[in-house]
Each structure stands twice: as structure tokens, then as C-alpha cells.
């Protein structure tokens, strides 16, 4: 029988019982919060061999072992995971080892076993055998090893049962618990699973299987199960489901939820039976099962129910993510925040239509309007009194409507009303008018020419670049020395510059008025040769990287005919040049025959240029007689590799567990104080613990239904 | 031929427990979501009961907790078990393949009565 | 859950008349409105689907509209055996409801 869409165990351990005529869970498995500790021999759930997405165990009091419980769990698919994990166990206080003795396989996703003060037989089992990438596993705070005296079944008569393999150089027995060992299949068998009797599986087999070589004989399937078999891929008129089955068109119109409507339902795309239309898709109607791409950013209609939305904050900003039209009033009023036109712009970057009126007033905050990216339609069915659709007031640090060069916005109906924006240039509001169309339509008192613009340089004139060099990690540029009518009045230049990997970057990206700004700036002082072209040396850059660079002049705030003179560059574009990749990463090497290695690596993170190929170097090396003195058949500790200087011999000296060998010395010495990059790593570390618990307590504590 | 055949009603006391059988035929049961509908003596219907292709469930206010809606794909068979009966849980049951948006046709048993009565 | 109401309760007409019957919904349920008639004795018998869909051997006397809130099912020439009680019901969200009914008699 297939459970699903998701099982949630909590409080009763009887609800354990929901799962007892279960073969595959279709979703997660939770079972947590059982506070009083219970007898749990008496519950056993032979037929569960799959889960589909992630199994969470969290303080469930009593609990000594998982093996009991699911004898015969042989797959976590990881379709969905929690937190990037296909199994956490977590603050299980009496839990003494995972005994899940038949688990072959976790698809995607890695574990997370963390302060299970009584958990043993962790170091016993390869997880490498289990998972794909070991390197994402976090295993900390359980039970020391060192008090756990793990011991796989048949070590004490010396009759090792199970099967050896290396971790971290250690070549030991492997088992999950004191009777049950890890089970590996024949190396012949290569990636394929293999039955209990060390049979070879069929290729489309994962885990295990009943017979050999029989694609319905598996225990879960590679790809996906159809109609008791597993197949490679979906035979027509079937579609992929939660990662693992095909099911049919009447299958996919049947799954119901309880918070969507009918017509919400489940839709088929790419071959796919899937909850809702994945990005930048649309459904095909109302009542359809299929999906269409949009034409630019998916359609998402939002309604305000008193009719205004007051964006106050960026919480408020945060109920607008994902709209494109905005059913209702806008009503902009941000007066402080941190980081506040990259945090609007997450949340309202994607608006596309108002259909009532915009109203931005005390929003000292803001620099520029750029944050409403998308913003092309004020509909102005509403109107605030005096009939305007567009209502600018009071924002003292208001420099930039929009850059109209990239902007279409039109104002359907509806004046606009510009006061006290001391720093808005007269100019751009008339070049708003152009551009909305709703020239001729407002008085003279509605745009107000002494009180916009009052503090800005609002008569620009333009600096010119004259030279520009570049290394892999320096510019230099130089530009032409401007002179303002009166010389006095020039203080210096502030260079401004930032990557931008595209071209489309404007001077008020990022930028908001409580010292947030995506730009670096530079102050460049006038130099004191009146012939000589200013200039500036940016360094510290990235290699083969693109920047967006522009000039500034400071000048006095002179008033002539109420404006201020100024003058700053275009935005010039400029890359850096190439230099040496960093180191590729993951160099992984294993032999598979006598004369062959296979060398396998990832890019570099820092590949500092376009890479056109790859230089792979190899030596012999001689065989090492210190893998020759010592018995590796004795249970006795492995000693420590250390080449050492002659003097002191290294066993003695691991035999002090209070000291290490440190730096160069010659003997016991005191721990190595520990390193900034190690202090920082544990600093991170220690964050990214309490980052996964409150996502863990957020995720699981919910309020109990009335 | 789609068919939604009933079994399992009957007289129980109030406390008391009954479980009711649909087997379908003639379409495939397993990619259906399966509703149980009632009628008391003289009232209107009353829907109380689904279960999705997942096996998801979904149930009335009125029965919540007290029944459970099963299926069994292997059988083609759709389950109601009813526990902590009252009277008036007094009604003719319908099990139904209702449609939806997609598949419109809806399909009903020919009911089965439960007398909930000391 | 979303409550549907029926009006009238009780419809008295004569044959070869038309009928409407009224179905309204607390909340918006889109087109996801389903009408069935019923006779004694025997189960419901879908007559519309959403609304305004009709169904292969329900005869075309029988109409639906309306989309929202406020839905009407047609009976545009009443025939003898259309005198039944006729339930409304919406499928747009669970719990799924149906309305009380409506009678419709001869007069």
C-alpha cells in the first residue's frame, strides 16, 4: 500500500499504527515529540521498504533503535528533502544506534545526525555506500566514539561477520549495530543492488531486490515503477510522479488538497504530473491541466482589501512578492530600513500594473523609484482627491524617478502631483510627463519648480574618459578636468564603481538614502596641475571580471538661476583582465584495472578567465615499506603516519591523549593555539547549527487545530 | 460499464461500529478519487468523505474522528468504516466517483442504508 | 466551508413551463458548480457540470450559468418526469457542500 502525502507522527506513539499496511511512503515520514518513553517492541512495520522524501526522527523518548521499526527501510529517495537532508535524527535522547540494517540507499540529499547524547555505530557505518557524496553529511554532538566501543557482530569470538572498507584511512568492519552488518554487494555487480544471497540485480533495481536480473523483482526501482515493473522512463500517456511512479492523466486530475480549488488542481508538464506550473509557466485556461510559458513574468493578480497598500516596511513590501498586477491603491511611505531598495525590489520588482493610484510621500529612505522595476501601467480607476493617479510628496532624498531611457510607463488616467523633493530635478518629472503620456494634463501647481530639485545639481554637464588600462586585478582611467564657470567651485571627483556581469546597470541600483549602495566609491582630490587630466588607480579587483565604473564632480552647491551646476560620466564598462584559474577542486583518482587510473575533478571556483583545457600530470612513486610494519590484522590502534626526525617515537607520544605533536618540536607539547581561519570556521559552524534547529523548530511546531 | 456496487449497511446501536464496501468496475479504480455522499430520512444530501488518487484523505466536520475512509486498489474496493455511531448518522450512504473539471462524469452506488438505533 | 443556498425551497409549475432555480455560494467557487436531480428512492443523477457543461444523454432542455457566487439551473419546457428535487453542489473546495434542494411539483 502506497501512504502519503506525507505522515506525521507526533505526541501518541499509537499513531505509529498509520503505518502499518505501508510498503512505500509517498513523502516524508516524521515521528517526533513523543515526550513519555514507551515500549516500542511491539511495533513493527516489515512492509515499509520506501520513502519517497526525507525521514525526520526528533525527540521521541524511548526509542532505542530504528532497526525494530523498519527492518526492512531499503530507500530514501530524497525527492523533497528537509533543510538539504534525506534522514535527520535529531535530540533522540535514548536512541542507541540507527539499526536500519536493510537502508542501501539515499538518492538525493545527505544526513544529519546531531545531539543524540546515547547514539553509538555511527563511525561503524560507510555511508559512502548509502549516498552518492558523503562530504555534505553532519554527524556532531552524538555519543564520543570513544565511549561507545562499537563492535561490529563476530569481533569479540574473532569471527568477523561483516565486510571491511576504508573511511578516512581507517579499514574496519562495518556494521549498524552489535548483531546486523552493513550489507555490500559483489564488486561484479558494479552499481547495481543485489539480493540477500549476493545475486546481481536488474540495472533498474535500487537497493535490493527478490531475484536476480528480474526488472519486477526489485525492491524499489532506479527510475520509475509502472504497473509492477521498473522502467527507465514513463511508457506513453503515463507521467512522472513525486520523482518515482507513472501514473495516468485520470491519476494526475484526481489528487485533491484541501487548499486549492478544483481547478487548481494537480497539472501535467514535460511529461510530469506536478503540483502547479513550474517557473515562468502559466496554466492554459482556468480549467485545464497543461501549462504554457508566459509571456515575460508569470501573471500573479493581488488584492488589497481595504483597497490602499501601505508599504511602510519591508514586511509590508513581503506580501507583494511574486504580484504583477496590484489590484488596489499603493501607498509608499518609508521613512528608515536597512538594505531598503534591494529588499523592495525583491518584493515589488516584478508589479507590473496598478490599477488604481501610486502614491510615494515622507519616504526618506528612498533614492529612486527604480526598486518598482517592472512597473509599466497606472490605470487610475482610482483617484486620490484632486484627480491624481501619481502623487510624489516630501521625500527628501528623492533623486530618480525612473531611467526613462529603459522605462515605458504609461498613466492611463489621472494627473500627477510633484512637492518638497528637494533633490528630484524639475527635468526628470517633465521627462515623466513625456514618457506616461499625461503632458497637458496637470496645472501649474501641480509640479512645483521651486520646491523639486531645490538641493541638486540639476544642470549636468558630462566628463568624458580619456585613457583606461587594465591588469587582472587594476584599472586605471583618467578623465577629462572639468571646468565649471567658476573654478573655486570644483572640491574633487568621487569614482564609482561596482561588477556588473550584464550591461543594464544604473546609478541608483542597490542605492537607498540610510547608506545602503551597491557602488563602491572612491575620492579622487583635484590634482594640484591645473594641466594634468584627473585619474584613479581601482585595485584589489577580480580577475577576468566586468565593472561598471562612473565620475562624479563634487562641486559647491552653487545656486545660478535657483539650479545648481554638476557634471558626471556616462557608465563606462570595462573587464579586467584574465589570470591564472584557482586550483581545480575535487580531485577524486581510483583505479579500475591494473594499468588504469580515472582522475575525475571539478571546475575551479575561480576560473579567472574563459578555460580551454585542463593539464593533468602523473609520476610513479615507490612503494612504501611503512605500509609493511605493522601488523594491520591486530585490533590495536593504527599509529599515527608522522615522518619523524629519528628522536622520539611516535607511538609513545599518541599515547598521551592530553598531548599532540605540534609545529617542529621534539616532544609532548600543548595544543596548538587555534588559527583565525580556524576560529572563523568554528564561528560558522556554530551559526549554521542554530540556523538549521530554528528552521528544524519552525518547520515542526505548529499550532494545535481547534 | 461503470458501476459502483454497495454492501455492509445495516441496524447498529448507537456506539457501535460498521464498515461499508463499494467495489467499481468497468474504469480504472486507482486513478479515481473516491467520495462517500448521505441522505437522512427526508433531508438533503450530505458529503462527508474523499480520498484522492494519493490516498489522501479528507472528511465532514460532523464525521471527523469518528470515520475513517479506506481504499484498496488491488480489490478495486472503497471503504468506510464508522465508528462511535450516533443516531443521527441515520442515513442511505452513497459511495460516488465525482468528477472533476478534467473528468466530468460522476458516478454514484445505488446507497445502502444505516440505522443507527438502540 | 462554503455554504450554498437554494431558492426557492419549493417550486410549483406546470408542465411545459420553465423553471429556474437558484443556487448562491458564500464565497467566490469560480465555475465549480455541479447540478443534480434527484427522484425518491433512487440516487442523485448529474444533470450540468461547472456551471454551464452539459452532459452526453441529459436531455438539452435542461441549462446552467453563472460563475462566482450566484448560479441558475434552466429547465426551459417542464416535462412529467422532470418533477424532482434538484441539488446544487460545489466541488471548488474541500469540504465539498451541497445545497438543501429545491422541490419542484406540479402546480
Known amino acids: 500500500e502506497i501512504c502519503g502525502p506525507g505522515i506525521d507522527i507526533r505526541n501518541d506513539y499509537q499513531q505509529l499504527k498509520r503505518l502499518e499496511n505501508c510498503t512505500v511512503i509517498e513523502g516524508y515520514l516524521h515521528i517526533l515529540l513523543i515526550s513519555k518513553a514507551e515500549d516500542y517492541r511491539s511495533y513493527r512495520f516489515p512492509k515499509l521498504t520506501v520513502i519517497t522524501e526525507y525521514l525526520l526522527l526528533f525527540r521521541v523518548a524511548g526509542l532505542e533503535s530504528l532497526g525494530d521499526l523498519f527492518p526492512n527501510l531499503t530507500v530514501i529517495r530524497g525527492w523533497k528533502l528537509f533543510y538539504n537532508y534525506a534522514l535527520v535524527i535529531f535530540e533522540m535522547t535514548n536512541l542507541k544506534d540507527i539499526g536500519l540494517y536493510n537502508l542501501r540507499n539515499i538518492t538525493r540529499g545527505a544526513i544529519r545526525i546531531e545531539k543524540n547524547a546515547d547514539l553509538c555505530y555511527l563511525s561503524t557505518v560507510d555511508w559512502s555506500l548509502i549516498l552518492d557524496a558523503v562530504s555534505n553529511n553532519y554527524i556532531v554532538g552524538n555519543k564520543p566514539p570513544k565511549e561507545c566501543g562499537d563492535l561490529c557482530p563476530g569481533t569479540m569470538e574473532e569471527k568477523p561477520m561483516c565486510e571491511k572498507t576504508t573511511i578516512n584511512n581507517e579499514y574496519n568492519y562495518r556494521c549498524w549495530t552489535t548483531n546486523r552488518c552493513q550489507k555490500m554487494c559483489p564488486s561484479t555487480c558494479g552499481k547495481r543492488a543485489c539480493t540477500e544471497n549476493n545475486e546481481c540485480c536488474h540495472p533498474e533495481c535500487l537497493g535490493s531486490c527478490s531475484a536476480p536480473d528480474n526488472d519486477t523483482a526489485c525492491v524499489a526501482c532506479r527510475h520509475y515503477y509502472y504497473a509492477g515493473v521498473c522502467v527507465p522512463a514513463c511508457p506513453p500517456n503515463t507521467y512522472r510522479f513525486e520523482g518515482w511512479r507513472c501514473v495516468d492523466r485520470d491519476f494526475c486530475a484526481n489528487i485533491l488538497s484541501a487548499e486549492s480549488s478544483d481547478s487548481e488542481g494537480f497539472v501535467i508538464h514535460d511529461g510530469e504530473c506536478m503540483q502547479e506550473c513550474p517557473s515562468g509557466f502559466i496554466r492554459n485556461g482556468s480549467q485545464s491541466m497543461y501549462c504554457i510559458p508566459c509571456e515575460g513574468p508569470c501573471p500573479k493578480v493581488c488584492e488589497e482589501e481595504k483597497k490602499t497598500k501601505t508599504i511602510d516596511s519591508v514586511t509590508s513590501a513581503q506580501m507583494l512578492q511574486g504580484c504583477t498586477i496590484f489590484k488596489g491603491n499603493l501607498l509608499i511611505n518609508i521613512r528608515r530600513g536597512n538594505n531598503i531598495a534591494s529588499e523592495l525590489e525583491n518584493f515589488m520588482g516584478l508589479i507590473e500594473v496598478v490599477t488604481g493610484y501610486v502614491k510615494i510621500r515622507h519616504s526618506h529612505a528612498l533614492v529612486s523609484l527604480s526598486f518598482l522595476k517592472n512597473l509599466r501601467l497606472i490605470l487610475g480607476e482610482e483617484q486620490l482627491e484632486g484627480n491624481y493617479s501619481f502623487y510624489v510628496l516630501d521625500n527628501q532624498n528623492l533623486q530618480q524617478l525612473w531611467d526613462w531611457d529603459h522605462r515605458n510607463l504609461t498613466i492611463k488616467a489621472g494627473k500627477m502631483y510633484f512637492a518638497f523633493n528637494p533633490k528630484l530635478c524639475v527635468s526628470e518629472i517633465y521627462r515623466m510627463e513625456e514618457v506616461t503620456g499625461t503632458k497637458g494634463r496637470q496645472s501649474k501647481g501641480d509640479i512645483n519648480t521651486r520646491n523639486n530639485g531645490e538641493r541638486a545639481s540639476c544642470e549636468s554637464d558630462v566628463l568624458h574618459f580619456t585613457s583606461t588600462t587594465t591588469s587582472k586585478n587594476r584599472i586605471i582611467i583618467t578623465w577629462h578636468r572639468y571646468r565649471p564657470p567658476d573654478y573655486r567651485d570644483l572640491i574633487s571627483f568621487t569614482v564609482y564603481y561596482k561588477e556588473a556581469p550584464f550591461k543594464n546597470v544604473t546609478e541608483y541600483d542597490g542605492q537607498d538614502a540610510c547608506g545602503s549602495n551597491s557602488w563602491n566609491m572612491v575620492d579622487v582630490d583635484l590634482p594640484p596641475n591645473k594641466d594634468v587630466e584627473p585619474g584613479i588607480l581601482l585595485h584589489g579587483l577580480k580577475p577576468w571580471t566586468q565593472y561598471a565604473v562612473y565620475v562624479k564632480a563634487v562641486t559647491l552647491t552653487m545656486v545660478e538661476n535657483d539650479h545648481i551646476r554638476g557634471a558626471k560620466s556616462e557608465i563606462l564598462y570595462i573587464r579586467t583582465n584574465a589570470s591564472v584559474p584557482s586550483i581545480p577542486l575535487d580531485v577524486l583518482s581510483a583505479s579500475n584495472s591494473s594499468s588504469q587510473l580515472i582522475v575525475k575533478w571539478n571546475p575551479p571556483s575561480l576560473p579567472n578567465g574563459n578555460l580551454s583545457y585542463y593539464i593533468v600530470r602523473w609520476q610513479r612513486q615507490p612503494q612504501d615499506g611503512y605500509l609493511y610494519r605493522h601488523n594491520y590484522c591486530s585490533k590495536d590502534k593504527i599509529p599515527i603516519r608522522k615522518y619523524a626526525d629519528g628522536t622520539i617515537d611516535i607511538e609513545e607520544v599518541t599515547e598521551n591523549p592530553k598531548t599532540e605533536v605540534c609545529g617542529g618540536e621534539k616532544g609532548p607539547c600543548c595544543a596548538c593555539p587555534k588559527t583565525e581561519a580556524e576560529k572563523q570556521a568554528e564561528k560558522e559552524e556554530a551559526e549554521y547549527r542554530k540556523v538549521f534547529e530554528n528552521f528544524l523548530h519552525n518547520s515542526i511546531f505548529v499550532p494545535r487545530p481547534e | 460499464e461503470v458501476q459502483l456496487v454497495q454492501s455492509g449497511g445495516g441496524l447498529v446501536k448507537p456506539g457501535g461500529s460498521l464498515r461499508l464496501s463499494c467495489a467499481a468496475s468497468?474504469?480504472?479504480?486507482?486513478?479515481?478519487?473516491m467520495h462517500w455522499v448521505r441522505q437522512a430520512p427526508g433531508k438533503g444530501l450530505e458529503w462527508i468523505s474523499v480520498i484522492d488518487t494519493r490516498g489522501a484523505t479528507y472528511y465532514a466536520d460532523s464525521v471527523k474522528g469518528r470515520f475513517t475512509i479506506s481504499r484498496d486498489n488491488a480489490k478495486n474496493s472503497l471503504y468506510l468504516q464508522m465508528n462511535s455511531l450516533r443516531a443521527e448518522d441515520t442515513a442511505v450512504y452513497y459511495c460516488a466517483r465525482l468528477g472533476n473539471f478534467y473528468y466530468g462524469m460522476h458516478v454514484w452506488g445505488q446507497g445502502t442504508t444505516v440505522t443507527v438505533s438502540s | 466551508e462554503i455554504v450554498l443556498t437554494q431558492s426557492p425551497g419549493t417550486l410549483s409549475v406546470s408542465p411545459g413551463e420553465r423553471a429556474t432555480l437558484s443556487c448562491r455560494a458564500s464565497q467566490s467557487i469560480g465555475s465549480s458548480l455541479h447540478w443534480y436531480q434527484q427522484k425518491p428512492g433512487q440516487a442523485p443523477r448529474l444533470l450540468i457540470k461547472y456551471a454551464s457543461q452539459s452532459l452526453s444523454g441529459i436531455p438539452d432542455r435542461f441549462s446552467g450559468s453563472g460563475s462566482g457566487t450566484d448560479f441558475t439551473l434552466t429547465i426551459s419546457r417542464l416535462e412529467p418526469e422532470d418533477f424532482a428535487v434538484y441539488y446544487c453542489h460545489q466541488s471548488s473546495r474541500l469540504p465539498h457542500t451541497f445545497g438543501q434542494g429545491t422541490k419542484v411539483e406540479i402546480k
Open positions: 468497468g474504469f480504472t479504480f486507482s486513478s479515481f478519487a
